[in-house]
């Protein structure tokens, strides 16, 4: 197993409709093939396999398990949306990559971006 | 409706190893997310460690992390926990439980709607 250096924001912020974006950029030192995506959440004292996907370079990623998770590659970037998320799923989110094939195996994990989810506050009744 | 049935415990020393399995009865088990959790008399019911329907996906407490290890086998309808260097503060009641919802970021968190009748877990020093 052969390291790998991963980059990813610091913080990003949530919509108000839950919905998080932020990119996972590797330094690939070869031409990979087939690359493995996995978003971890450490927080709570828990750590969380949110969502993975394994997708061949230049095809978009699938998404197992009713995903919460959609994204897209571009080169050594990989853009992850996560949708549905709620104030208390606020926490560190961690982008780790592998390098599946061709040998040699390239395993990276990123520092973690921490998103932050705000519940939008319930629209007062209105007359009108 | 599923039916829950836990195995595997037992009172073993510190160190040592145990595999608890669940069995599960009902047509759907496939569609679960499934958790085990773990209850000290007096204390409330904890989380320990939750897999995705499918089995791809995990989430665990901190304080297991590296030393258990779940896993599923939807074909035979089983869940299963590896419990590796045990510590006696790993002594419990433990449970499994299925929840009907789709994986999320905060597993523990989902309804759990069935429970099994838990079993007993010791571990001396």
């Known amino acids: 197993c052969k390291a790998m250096h991963v980059a990813q924001p610091a913080v990003v912020l949530a919509s108000s409709r839950g919905i998080a974006s932020f990119v996972c950029e590797y330094a690939s030192p070869g031409k990979a093939t087939e690359v493995r995506v996995t978003v971890l959440r450490q927080a709570d004292s828990q750590v969380t396999e949110v969502c993975a996907a394994t997708y061949m370079m230049g095809n978009e990623l699938t998404f197992l398990d009713d995903s919460i998770c959609t994204g897209t590659s571009s080169g050594n970037q990989v853009n992850l949306t996560i949708q549905g998320l709620r104030a208390m799923d606020t926490g560190l989110y961690i982008c780790k990559v592998e390098l599946m094939y061709p040998p040699p195996y390239y395993l990276g994990i990123g520092n973690g971006t921490q998103i932050y989810v705000i519940d939008p506050e319930p629209c007062p009744d209105s007359d009108f | 409706e599923v039916q829950l049935v836990e195995s595997g415990g037992g009172l073993v020393q510190a160190g040592d190893s145990l595999r608890l399995s669940c069995a599960a009865s009902?047509?759907?088990?496939?569609?679960?997310?499934m958790g085990w959790f773990r209850q000290a008399p007096g204390k409330e019911r904890e989380f320990v460690s939750a897999?995705?329907?499918?089995?791809?996906?995990?989430s665990y407490t901190d304080s297991v992390k590296g030393r258990f290890a779940i896993s599923r086998d939807n074909a035979k309808k089983m869940l299963y926990l590896q419990m590796s260097s045990l510590k006696p503060e790993d002594t419990d009641v433990y449970y499994c439980?299925?929840?009907?919802?789709?994986?999320?970021?905060?597993?523990?968190?989902?309804?759990?709607?069935?429970w099994g009748q838990g079993t007993q877990v010791t571990v001396s020093s």
């Open positions: 009902g047509r759907t088990f496939s569609n679960y997310v």
């Open positions: 439980a299925a929840a009907r919802g789709p994986w999320s970021a905060r597993p523990s968190l989902l309804t759990y709607d069935y």
């Open positions: 897999i995705s329907p499918s089995g791809t996906l995990t």
